[in-house]
Interface confidence: low
């Protein structure tokens, strides 16, 4: 059959070379002459040549030695073609399997290794691990296992089989009893390394053991008892370095101190910790001491190691009585943040409230008052009462100085001490809101056809708050009602300007009063433009070119010319009577709106 | 006229403080706040900070555990300090008025600067 | 912080030329409140102080001649010199005063050519 079983070579094969591996044949050549070719990495692509076959007899050929730790395996195809070039069977596997042979030692992954270990540590304890690695096949055969061994221990007191190594694992640990640091600090030992699971070749590296101290010595107090002064009211103030001597070694974790409060300290005013150089506790304050309160503390201090102790020691303890020294102390705002309620633009004079301020002091001391931030300059304060009164217009919809209704005042209050103390309190005015703006109308310019005009929607505005807003009312002043209307909407919160009769193209002012639901009334003139134009519109078109429609008949131009001197001198005769002088562009819009009455019957 | 005048030491070693004083005139420092903005040689500004007229302070953050700006109204100084100085700190330092104190003046824009004063840092 | 970013960096005109110069924030600068665009620019010339030209992105400093003109909303912006002088020579910058710490553009230098 066209099968070729997985074919087994050793590495490192002496030859020699070609060396015949497997014979390829195909029961096809009965029929016709076979040529044999094989490809795959190792024949035609790289590593090319590694492999070859005769071309007529079909024997697989190994061509140099092979490197399993290179290349464990290659997957080859064999092909068969008849003379003319056409295959006559499907590509063939040809698996290669390299077997290994003991070409490699053992490497340890570093020259020298660290650990430590407690003195005086049970037999067991585990020190360190050390890892060496062996290139060999470690699956198939013990070229590449390796066994783990001490040669050699320096020194070798109190004897020369302290440690041990496991075969398999490389984990050092401690064999015997009796390890002293203050005797031996530090072991050296040798390892070895073997492959064929400790039958075959060897390396050595070096493993150092340190000899830790442990925790044998309880640290002490020098002295027992301290006495310090403190001011009050200061945090983070350091009140006193306590002093220990360990005899364990310096800066280990059996000699590092840990400080403890143990008593005296029920208000949790002090904390202590230990000073990273001179292993020294320093006693601060965590909170400020209150010389009214109590003017002396005695606190316990016990101290002990960072490390727990190897044997049953006593644990010392610290006194130190903390003397409270009185200073002069801040007046307090009550409460430090007030929220008051104040109408805006109440008159100036108007008292807005009394924010007064305490001294912790027991000396009965004389607090004077001032305005530290007024941002707007609304207010003044009574230095003696803490009376806070109105100077300016508090106006809540001023958004420069007001977020919220609320204007931010910080005041400051003075005590007559040596030397004097400030505190300073926050006062929130909350501004309640009245009636002092009218409704404004959005946009104040508009531009609208004469001719089929669509009405302009307005927004309206009004600073104030509910119930000083909407719904509002709306109504034309100064004669703007004879061509235009203004309508509030249902929701009562836009106005609809309509132009209601004919105007030339030109600009014009519509005055529209706007009222609130207070009845507070704001007049404001809209800019208006009208264009010659049908319908909506937003910039005016070139100049309005009239016309007079068909034929354009002598007649009809007569008529025009009497109708508009009839206007003109109606027009003289109204503007004597009763018109005033700022109706003077409606009028001249009313003649042409007759030439255009006129103008559309002629047609 | 409003003037406002740079004072500073030209040369400092790093790691050690530069105190700048920023001396004004035609103005008084309870109406304007006054910035500091440095500019390192070839390059362009950076805010520093500013102190307004009441003594508060906004800085960069960037620099502002290095920064301090405080202020003597009557003397009508301002001053900066800046500590642990490096190289990279060396540049021409500026003091330079608000337009005004509200926001509504565009305090945010600077009107008048100082000549500005050379700091090299340097060893 | 707000990065102000200017562009181009440097251009060479000839006097009488019209120029523009643009900066853009990476965030908005108008402030809804108000309708105000927190944007300044200033001039520095050779050796001198700078010295503001615009506020609110476009309300000229007093003694500021009207050939300056500041425009733009938002994020971008653009400083117009309609006809260039050769006093105009100096860096440009635009500075934000919208949020802390208050940032300046990179500069745009204007060489004469």
């Known amino acids: 059959d066209w099968v070729v079983a997985p074919i087994s070579v050793p590495e490192n094969g002496k030859g020699p070379f070609p060396q015949r591996l497997n014979q390829l044949k195909s029961n096809k050549d009965r029929d016709t002459k076979i040529f044999y070719s094989i490809t795959g990495p190792g024949a035609d692509s790289p590593p090319e040549g590694v492999f070859a076959v005769e071309k007529e007899t079909g024997w697989l050929l190994l061509n140099k030695p092979l490197d399993r730790e290179e290349i464990a395996k290659y997957e080859l195809f064999g092909h068969a073609v008849s003379e003319n070039g056409a295959s006559v069977e499907d590509p063939m596997n040809i698996s290669i399997i390299v077997t290994d042979q003991n070409d490699h030692k053992p490497k340890f992954t570093q020259d020298t290794f660290r650990g430590s270990v407690l003195e005086g540590v049970l037999p067991g304890t585990s020190v360190m691990q050390v890892t060496a690695t062996d290139e060999d096949d470690a699956i198939y055969t013990y070229n590449g296992v390796v066994a783990y061994s001490i040669h050699s221990q320096e020194p070798k007191d109190p004897h020369d089989l302290m440690f041990t190594i496991h075969r398999s694992t490389g984990t050092i640990s401690v064999i015997s009893s009796g390890l002293d640091r203050e005797k031996v600090p530090e072991y050296t030992l040798t390892i070895q390394a073997t492959d064929m699971d400790g039958d075959g070749s060897t390396t050595t590296a070096v493993a150092v053991v340190e000899i830790l101290d442990a925790n044998d010595n309880a640290p002490m107090f020098e002295p027992q008892k301290y006495e310090a002064w403190v001011p009050e009211n200061e945090v983070g103030h350091e009140v006193q370095r306590l002093t220990v001597t360990d005899l364990d070694v310096p800066n280990s974790p059996a000699w590092r101190a840990t400080y403890h409060i143990v008593g005296g300290d029920d208000g949790d005013h002090f904390t202590i910790t230990t000073h990273p150089e001179t292993n020294q506790g320093v006693l601060t304050t965590k909170k400020g001491l209150d010389f009214e309160a109590q003017d002396q503390h005695t606190l316990y201090v016990e101290v002990t190691n960072e490390a727990p102790f190897a044997v049953k020691l006593p644990t010392a303890t610290a006194t130190v009585v903390v003397h409270v020294k009185d200073v002069n102390e801040a007046p307090v705002f009550v409460p430090p943040s007030k929220v008051v309620e104040v109408q805006e633009g109440i008159p100036t004079g108007e008292p807005v409230c009394v924010y007064t301020a305490e001294d912790p002091d027991k000396e009965n001391q004389k607090i004077s008052y001032r305005i530290l931030r007024d941002p707007a300059g609304w207010l003044a304060m009574d230095p003696d009462s803490g009376q806070v009164t109105a100077v300016g217009t508090l106006d809540r919809e001023d958004e420069q100085f007001v977020r919220n209704n609320i204007y931010e005042v910080m005041v400051l209050a003075m005590d007559n001490g040596s030397p004097p103390t400030t505190g300073t309190g926050t006062l929130l005015l909350t501004l309640i809101d009245v009636n002092d703006h009218g409704p404004v109308p959005e946009p104040r310019q508009i531009t609208i056809c004469n001719q089929s005009p669509v009405r302009q929607v307005l927004n309206i505005t009004d600073k104030d708050l509910s119930p000083h807003t909407s719904p509002f009312q709306a109504q034309l002043t100064d004669d703007s009602d004879i061509y235009w209307t203004a309508e509030v909407n249902e929701e009562g919160d836009t106005v609809v300007l309509s132009l209601k009769k004919f105007l030339k193209q030109d600009t014009y002012d519509v005055h529209l009063s706007l009222s609130d639901h207070g009845n507070k009334e704001q007049l404001t003139v809209i800019r208006a433009t009208v264009c010659d134009c049908h319908g909506h519109v937003e910039t005016c078109p070139g100049p309005w070119k009239g016309g007079s429609g068909g034929g354009g008949s002598g007649a009809g131009v007569i008529a025009v010319i009497v109708v508009v001197v009839i206007a003109i001198v109606a027009g003289i005769v109204v503007l004597v009577i009763s018109r005033k002088k700022r109706m003077a562009k409606y009028e001249k819009a009313e003649i042409k709106e007759m030439g255009e009455m006129h103008r559309e019957l002629n047609a | 006229v409003q003037l406002l005048e740079e004072s500073g030491p030209g040369l400092v070693a790093p790691s050690q403080s530069l105190s700048i004083t920023c001396t004004v005139s035609g103005f008084s420092l309870t109406s304007y706040p006054i910035n500091w903005v440095r500019q390192p040689p070839g390059k362009g500004l950076e805010w520093l900070g500013v102190?307004?007229?009441?003594?508060?302070?906004n800085y960069n953050s960037a620099l502002k555990s290095r920064l301090s700006i405080t202020k003597d109204n009557s003397k009508s100084q301002v001053f900066l300090k800046m500590t642990s100085l490096q190289t990279d700190d060396t540049a021409r330092y500026y003091c330079?008025?608000?337009?005004?104190?509200?926001?509504?003046?565009?305090?945010?824009?600077?009107?008048?600067w100082g000549q500005g004063t050379t700091v090299t840092v340097s060893s | 912080e707000l990065v102000m970013t200017q562009s181009p960096s440097s251009l060479a005109v000839s006097v009488g030329e019209k120029v523009t110069m643009s900066c853009k924030s990476s965030?908005?600068?108008?402030?809804?409140?108000?309708?105000?665009?927190?944007l300044a620019w200033y001039q520095q010339k050779p050796g001198q102080s700078p010295k503001l030209l615009i506020y609110?992105?476009?309300t000229r400093e007093s003694g500021v001649p009207d050939r300056f003109t500041g425009s733009g909303s938002g994020t971008d912006f653009t400083l117009t010199i309609s006809s260039v002088k050769a006093e105009d020579l100096a860096v440009y910058y635009c500075?934000?005063?919208?949020?802390?710490?208050?940032?300046f553009g990179g500069g745009t230098k204007l060489e004469i050519k």
């Open positions: 609110w992105a476009s």
């Open positions: 330079a008025k608000s337009r005004g104190v509200y926001d509504f003046d565009g305090r945010g824009a600077m009107d008048y």
């Open positions: 500075q934000q005063y919208y949020s802390y710490p208050y940032t």
């Open positions: 965030q908005s600068l108008l402030y809804s409140s108000n309708q105000k665009n927190y």
């Open positions: 102190i307004w007229t009441g003594g508060g302070t």
